[in-house]
């Protein structure tokens, strides 16, 4: 069964003579391991002795004998998959078949591998792509059916020569599919490089130049032209000629087809290679080229720029912005068609000429109000002056000017008036839109810039005004000035600190919060009656008949303001005391007698203590004492003291008389 | 280790037979390949017949063929060579050789190839 044995390698194998050749190899045996192996060179079965006529160039069996040629031959194999090979130096007569003879356990093999071994080192051979197109890269691959680790070699590209700058890519392969070398090199062709020589040279390590391989190049372009022109410098007045002639330098393939294209756009009826110009206008200047086209596309030729000179057009202006803002910068533009180019302009403001603007574009860095109007410019050439144009509007706009707050009432507003006040104003661009009032209030705007304000605040300080367009501009504020009078007026107690008891020195002041105008007059009253004038009521001794009801006014030119109604109260011991006797100071025995101690007292007494006509204390604390049933030893003189926080106060003596009954009589 | 010893040989008149046998020791008999080769003096060894065991196909060598046949006996690890009708050219020891297949790409021998371990042979004489 001849699929035992499975051996893998190239087929052929190329060097050449002092070159070597490794021999990428490998086998898989039916059972075990390799026992012999024998590399025969044309190995040659003889059917009678059933033996290989050939030479031996290496021999490895199991007695170990091995040849003096197995220097330059070398088995780099193992006993069970690897049988690479290596002939250093290989020579000419090496050519023909290696026969690997291989001895495992059960069996005998003969592997056959092909040697092709050339007298000088071969050529490589350059691969191109089917077609090279102008500025597309392709890939050049030199392949060279040759590799050895013993030998080492290098593969340069030229071009006419010349070794390319391009770095090429080179790779090599000692497998058992393949053995070679190659270099491929990535490589955008123009079309000047169409019929130029690549080589590709093989060299030795050194450099040493050994075969080379030749192609010439055919790269694929589209016409490549030249256009003349008459006059060479294609500037022309109007009314002159003009001749274009377009020559091809080189078309791979042929050309087909001519045009000539102006600005991009193609002049019909003109296919030919030479461009007749009669009689020039204006209009005809431009960019002109001729286009040749062949199969892979049109070639088009450098731009002629034809100009054909003229005196300036009439001219307009550009506003670099309008309106503009006061205070912003502003850029002015003349525009006018003119070949050659103006050298000189002449600017005017409302018809006025501008000293001293020769330029282009004015340029006014600020901005002011009376830079508003109409601009216009002429421009000027060697072929002559162009016209004036319609010029240009420039409109400055700015916030409304001098701005203030008028008061239209006669002076002075007092509190409670009705007060008219308008926003006034100087000039405005654009127009004034809208008005705003500081401070904001619920007030009617009766018209534009007119404010109403009703009931009048005693507060109302100042008032200011904006005028509005697309900015406000604030008025300084106004004062309204509003007078009044006093406020918040009330009594305060100035001394003592304290509560006031009878004797003390006591002052009153009268206070106000404020008053417009300030001069003010105070007047005091008690009880409906006139006290003083002066702001404090002084008391010097205090009584408490001084105790009641104190109001203070206090008045200016606008009106009188008085205060709430402000209490004294005097605090003094118990006085005035009393014993009052109910029914009388005469009753029967058996009856009801009620005795009172009557006092004025602030506070009001808080303690009694009652007394008899020995000065004994009586066990009653009470205002009132109540005897019942009386009796006749109740008779005789009684007192009281009534006590509260400022003190005592004791009453006279009253005497209580108890008669006898008439029974207590008749028994008797 | 293969070792072989043939046996049968002998002086024969021309036209004659002989059965020469070997018997081989130390080989896996069946898969192998056998042979019977033989040198007159003074000439190269060369081969007579060969067998394939494994298929049992044969060789005869141009100037045999017809007279001499090649068999085996697997039980016995034996290899016979009947000659027949011998005539004086085929006087010369005759070797006996067992030896592994050998395969040459898809080629697979019928004889044993490079074979170099020999018996001491047998010698087969034919004369008058």
């Known amino acids: 069964d001849s699929s035992k044995w499975v051996f893998e390698h190239p087929e052929t194998l190329y060097a050449w003579e002092g070159a070597c050749v490794w021999i990428p190899c490998t086998y898989r045996a039916l059972d075990g391991d390799l026992e012999s192996f024998i590399l025969f060179h044309n190995p040659e079965y003889n059917k009678n002795t059933s033996k290989f006529d050939g030479t031996r160039l290496y021999e490895s069996t199991k007695d170990g004998k091995v040849p003096s040629e197995q220097k330059r031959v070398q088995f780099l194999g193992d006993k069970n998959k690897n049988c690479t090979l290596s002939i250093h130096p290989v020579h000419l007569n090496d050519s023909g078949q290696l026969g690997l003879r291989m001895e495992s356990k059960t069996e005998k093999w003969m592997e056959r591998i092909h040697l092709n071994v050339s007298e000088r080192p071969f050529p490589p051979h350059i691969q191109l792509p089917p077609e090279i197109q102008e500025s597309q890269e392709v890939t050049l691959t030199c392949l060279l059916n040759f590799s050895c680790y013993g030998y080492p070699i290098q593969l340069q590209w030229l071009l006419e020569g010349v070794p390319m700058r391009q770095a090429a890519v080179t790779s090599t392969s000692l497998t058992i599919k393949s053995v070679f070398t190659r270099s491929e090199l990535k490589f955008s062709p123009q079309w000047s490089h169409h019929g130029k020589i690549v080589t590709c040279q093989l060299q030795d390590a050194d450099g040493k130049f050994l075969s080379n391989d030749t192609v010439q190049l055919n790269v694929k372009h589209t016409p490549k032209l030249e256009i003349k022109v008459t006059p060479s410098d294609a500037i022309v007045r109007e009314g002159d000629s003009v001749t274009m002639t377009c020559e091809v330098s080189s078309s791979n393939p042929e050309y087909t087809t001519v045009s000539w294209l102006k600005d991009g756009t193609s002049l019909k009826k003109q296919n030919t290679f030479t461009l007749n110009l009669r009689e020039v206008t204006k209009d005809q200047s431009g960019k002109y080229c001729c286009q040749v086209s062949n199969d892979v596309g049109p070639g088009r030729s450098e731009e002629v720029f034809l100009q054909v000179q003229y005196a300036p057009e009439p001219s307009t202006v550009q506003i670099l912005h309008s309106p503009a803002v006061e205070g912003s910068q502003v850029e002015f533009l003349c525009m006018s068609l003119a070949n050659p180019l103006p050298t000189n302009y002449t600017w005017y403001h409302n018809g006025k000429e501008m000293q001293g603007r020769t330029e282009e574009k004015v340029h006014i860095p600020k901005i002011l109000p009376w830079h508003a109007g109409t601009y216009s410019c002429v421009a000027e050439n060697i072929l002559g002056t162009g016209q004036r144009g319609p010029g240009a509007e420039l409109d400055v706009q700015y916030p409304p000017k001098k701005v203030t707050t008028v008061i239209q009432n006669p002076m002075p507003i007092r509190e409670g008036d009705t007060v008219t006040l308008s926003c006034n104003y100087n000039s405005s661009n654009p127009s004034v839109t809208r008005y705003e009032w500081k401070p904001h209030g619920a007030w009617e705007e009766p018209s534009l810039g007119v404010l109403k304000i009703q009931n009048v605040g005693w507060d109302n300080t100042t008032i200011a005004c904006a005028a509005c367009n697309s900015w406000c501009s604030w008025a300084s504020p106004v004062a309204l000035n509003v007078q009044y009078a006093p406020r918040d007026v009330r009594v305060r107690k100035i001394k003592p600190l304290s509560e006031i008891h009878s004797g003390n020195s006591v002052s009153l002041q009268c206070d106000f919060s404020s008053s417009h105008p300030k001069e003010v007059q105070f007047f005091w009253e008690k009880n409906g009656r006139l006290l003083g004038k002066e702001s404090q009521l002084n008391f010097d001794s205090i009584s408490p008949e001084d105790a009641g009801s104190y109001s203070c006014w206090v008045n200016n030119s606008i009106g009188q303001t008085a205060s709430k109604a402000w209490t004294l109260e005097v605090l003094y011991a118990p006085r005035r005391l009393r014993v009052s006797m109910s029914p009388g100071d005469q009753v029967m025995e058996g009856k009801s007698a009620t005795l009172t101690c009557e006092s004025d007292a602030n506070p009001p007494v808080s303690h009694y203590t009652w007394f008899d006509w020995n000065n004994q204390s009586l066990p009653y604390h009470s205002q009132k004492l109540r005897l019942e049933p009386v009796k006749v030893q109740h008779s005789g003189a009684y007192w009281c003291q009534g006590t509260n926080s400022v003190g005592k106060g004791r009453s006279p003596l009253s005497t209580l008389t108890v008669y006898y009954s008439p029974e207590t009589i008749g028994r008797r | 280790q293969v070792k072989l010893e043939e046996s049968g040989g002998g002086l024969v008149q021309p036209g004659g037979s002989l059965r020469l046998s070997c018997t081989v020791s130390g080989v896996t008999f069946d898969y192998y390949v056998m042979g019977w080769f033989r040198q007159a003096p003074g000439k190269e060894r060369e081969v007579v017949s060969c067998m394939r065991n494994s298929d049992g196909v044969t060789y005869y060598a141009d100037s045999v063929k017809g007279r001499f046949t090649i068999s085996r006996d697997n039980a016995k690890n034996t290899v016979y060579l009947q000659m027949n009708s011998l005539k004086p050219d085929d006087t010369a020891i005759y070797y006996c050789?067992?030896?592994?297949?050998?395969?040459?790409?898809?080629?697979?021998?019928?004889?044993?190839?490079?074979?170099?371990?020999w018996g001491q042979g047998t010698q087969v004489t034919v004369s008058s």
């Open positions: 050789a067992v030896d592994k297949p050998f395969y040459d790409g898809g080629n697979y021998y019928t004889c044993p190839v490079d074979f170099d371990s």
